[in-house]
Interface confidence: medium
């Protein structure tokens, strides 16, 4: 099947950025795409490419750019108001309880079990036992066949903010 | 390998309707966005409406919104286009297409590959 | 939401030729190219920042800045005549759209 891409290849390249905006506060707050000056009197525009917020906020500075590493795809670019979107390559996956990197996912199922779920980039294949229909967690002791039609590509640490 | 096929399309009269199917093989259908794509004759490329991995979300271009219903089968690994109130300006060429990754939200609307197309002329 | 495209560029064979796109969705998604040959189904060429799929020749590349994307081909050959249709998702996210689409001739 064809590969995966992260957010960083959903969306464009990083921006030069263009002169920082001032707009005054509503009620102490700063619109999204926008953080608040240290005096509280003017809202900053974040540097496009750069730096995002996504909520009104009294940051005294917009939050850094995620940058995508070399085992994902980017889907979408980071704008003023939305961070960078990466997903895993094909053949790799994130959990959310390990965010930090994409891993390979398993090839097969152990003996005596049968795949039910596919690799996609948030999971790994799901095995379930032939005769009690269980799920599998854990390490696979033992392959007993390839279930999977690409091998993906190396795990690469995964960073998330920048 | 991968492969999408067409089929359903034809001459239809003005007002009436078709309903086009895609057979998708070589892949996991039910882990991709699929869409919609058409071509008038001598025309650039349109898309016309994508369907999420379960069918819980459907979009489509503002032309045909109303009379088109897009869903998908897949346990039988297919996609459908159910075109009512048909007009002379929806004679095309209907190209099947698979969003390129797997995606958990939107659509990446990247897409690769494509059906070779049914044809569907409306005419009197 | 729409992308606008040139209708027609030629090049010289051999020569390095750019296709643009424009529309104030690139700013927030990449675009993909498609290129399509006579009685053809589109073929996806160039997606994201720059990413060929395989077994498309790597004299195609891609690129953006601003509102723009961009296709090079690179040492055109005859055999890349065709037309080329840039998308992308559009300003909402949801929808997609394409390009009305580039004549490339290779002279």
């Known amino acids: 099947e064809s590969a995966l891409i992260t957010q960083q290849d959903l969306a464009p390249q990083q921006r030069a950025a263009p002169q920082q905006k001032r707009s005054s506060p509503s009620e102490g707050l700063c619109p999204p795409g926008h953080h608040i000056s240290e005096d509280g009197r003017d809202c900053i525009s974040c540097k496009y490419g750069q730096d995002y917020s996504t909520h009104w906020n009294d940051l005294l500075f917009c939050l850094r750019c995620t940058r995508c590493d070399s085992g994902e795809v980017e889907l979408s670019p980071c704008t003023t108001t939305r961070n960078t979107v990466c997903q895993c390559e094909e053949g790799t996956f994130r959990e959310e309880d390990s965010p930090e990197m994409c891993r390979k996912c398993r090839t097969g199922c152990p003996r005596g079990m049968v795949k039910v779920g596919d690799c996609t980039p948030w999971s790994d294949i799901e095995c379930v036992h032939k005769e009690s229909g269980t799920k599998h967690s854990g390490e696979v002791p033992a392959v007993e066949e390839t279930v999977t039609s690409s091998p993906g590509t190396p795990a690469s640490p995964c960073s998330l903010s920048g | 390998g991968v492969q999408l096929v067409e089929s359903g399309g034809g001459l239809v009269q003005p007002g009436g309707s078709l309903r086009l199917s895609c057979a998708a093989s070589?892949?996991?259908?039910?882990?991709?966005?699929m869409s919609w794509v058409r071509q008038a004759p001598g025309k650039g490329l349109e898309w016309v409406a994508n369907?999420?991995?379960?069918?819980?979300?459907?979009y489509y271009v503002d032309s045909v919104k109303g009379r088109f219903t897009i869903s998908r089968d897949n346990a039988k690994n297919s996609l459908y286009l159910q075109m009512n109130s048909l007009r002379a300006e929806d004679t095309a060429v209907y190209y099947c297409?698979?969003?390129?990754?797997?995606?958990?939200?939107?659509?990446?609307?990247?897409?690769?590959?494509w059906g070779r197309g049914t044809t569907v002329t409306v005419s009197s | 939401s729409e992308l606008t495209q040139d209708p027609a560029v030629s090049v010289a064979l051999g020569q390095t030729v750019r296709i643009t796109c424009q529309g104030d969705?690139?700013?927030?998604?990449?675009a993909s190219w498609y290129q399509q040959k006579p009685g053809q189904a589109p073929v996806l060429v160039i997606y994201?920042?720059?990413n060929r799929p395989s077994g498309i020749p790597d004299r195609f590349s891609g690129s953006s800045s601003g509102n723009t994307a961009s296709l090079t081909i690179t040492g055109a050959q005859a055999e890349d005549e065709a037309d080329y249709y840039c998308?992308?998702?559009?300003?909402?996210?949801?929808?997609?759209?394409f390009g009305g689409g580039t004549k490339l001739t290779v002279l």
């Open positions: 369907i999420k991995q379960d069918g819980s979300e459907k």
């Open positions: 998308n992308s998702r559009d300003s909402s996210g949801n929808h997609v759209v």
């Open positions: 297409a698979r969003d390129l990754l797997k995606v958990k939200g939107s659509s990446s609307g990247w897409f690769d590959p």
């Open positions: 994201g920042k720059n």
């Open positions: 070589g892949f996991t259908f039910s882990s991709y966005w």
């Open positions: 969705s690139l700013r927030s998604y990449y």
